[in-house]
Amino acid sequence: ESGYAQNGDLEDAELDDYSFSCYSQLEVNGSQHSLTCAFEDPDVNITNLEFEICGALVEVKCLNFRKLQEIYFIETKKFLLIGKSNICVKVGEKSLTCKKIDLTTIVKPEAPFDLSVVYREGANDFVVTFNTSHLQKKYVKVLMHDVAYRQEKDENKWTHVNLSSTKLTLLQRKLQPAAMYEIKVRSIPDHYFKGFWSEWSPSYYFRTPEINNSSGEMDPI
């Protein structure tokens, strides 16, 4: 194959200036999958540069990416999802650099949504729930979620909880009373598919109750 050296000794002979990274999203638009690539150096002059993917495709040998400002993008049903594809940066017919990538190992899930927190007075806890479009998907159905929360005044002091369901209970006694909290969630593939964390969901803000002096318990909001 053109576009890369033929043995280990020459493997770094490619032009480092054109290093890039990609992520895939499966069933992102109905049954269509997407592949997004971008150069790691934002200063690369992309004027004449194109991306092409070949191999592990259905019915076609290669597909060309569309350029959307700084990113390159494909939306298609034609990913075989088994075997490695060769993704190349090209100028005309010349390949500048290529990567062999299995699209099932670079999956980035869609961000969770509808995050909310409900205080249960009787149970003295907070029930965190959120939704994910992946519950309806046929491929990347199993995700690990990362719920992160912090007291609003503690800028970088996030507490993280990993879970596989879309519901989490936070005990009231683990949180500061009468404080404003920010909470958000993201997802990563689990079971067969591999890849990257999704974007964070929009943050949700909630306030913990005051401590009730007579009982030592928090007052509801």
Partner: antibody, heavy 118, light 111 residues
Framework: QVQLVQSGAEVKKPGASVKVSCKAS????????LHWVRQAPGQGLEWMGG????????AYNQKFKGRVTMTSDRSTSTVYMELSSLRSEDTAVYYC???????????WGQGTTVTVSS | DIVLTQSPDSLAVSLGERATINCRTS??????????MHWYQQKPGQPPKLLIY???NLESGVPDRFSGSGSETDFTLTISSLQAEDVAVYYC?????????FGGGTKVEIK
């Protein structure tokens, strides 16, 4: 053409270790994971584990955990499989195999016979 | 571990006739349309050779008399017209879950 060439046959005593090599050529070494599969005499195939030459990351069959170590040398495009605490039931042909995808094996080495005998 | 059971253990077929080998798994090896089942041919004294990957995709250079089908837990390798050079042991293999396991093999001979 794409080739995996393995080291020669070995005879070992029980309790010893063996290290088998597999040299890749004809493709970019870091593009594909390399795995080890063994076959006892007259028996079927058994996956032992694999290594990603790009990162050095490994995945081992739990059955061999603690006894098997897989390494790679990018400068020579070679991977190694070391199996320790050998016993007679480790007598087998050991194959290295390239993973064309997750996880099927599209190119195989010629095999290395390891005999464990006192 | 996922157990792969091949049937029959051995098969004698006349030249030019169809040979069918089955592989049943102890749990599903499919994720929707992604079927993580592969087939190999092994001749005496040689390493295995990949024939079919992803249940039905023919490996480059493999004659099109070989075909694969199936999903979930039941898969089939078919040789549409057996040739003398097809005498070998055939193995199925799953790759959905570590450890990646093989079937016990099916020996194909000429009747």
């Amino acid at each position: 053409q794409v080739q995996l060439v393995q080291s020669g046959a070995e005879v070992k005593k029980p309790g010893a270790s063996v290290k088998v090599s597999c040299k890749a050529s004809g493709y970019r070494f870091t593009d594909y994971e390399l795995h080890w599969v063994r076959q006892a005499p007259g028996q079927g195939l058994e996956w032992m584990g694999g290594i990603d030459p790009k990162t050095g990351g490994t995945a081992y069959n739990q059955k061999f955990k603690g006894r098997v170590t897989m390494t790679s040398d990018r400068s020579t495009s070679t991977v190694y499989m070391e199996l320790s605490s050998l016993r007679s039931e480790d007598t087998a042909v050991y194959y290295c195999a390239r993973s064309g995808g997750r996880w099927y094996f599209d190119v195989w080495g010629q095999g290395t016979t390891v005999t464990v005998s006192s | 571990d996922i157990v792969l059971t091949q049937s029959p253990d051995s098969l004698a077929v006349s030249l030019g006739e169809r040979a069918t080998i089955n592989c049943r798994t102890s749990e599903s090896v499919s994720i929707h349309l992604l079927h993580l089942m592969h087939w190999y041919q092994q001749k005496p004294g040689q390493p295995p050779k990949l024939l079919i990957y992803g249940a039905s995709n023919l490996e480059s250079g493999v004659p099109d008399r070989f075909s694969g089908s199936g999903s979930e837990t039941d898969f089939t390798l078919t040789i549409s017209s057996l040739q003398a050079e097809d005498v070998a042991v055939y193995y199925c293999q799953q790759s959905i879950k570590d450890p990646y396991t093989f079937g016990g093999g099916t020996k194909v001979e000429i009747k």
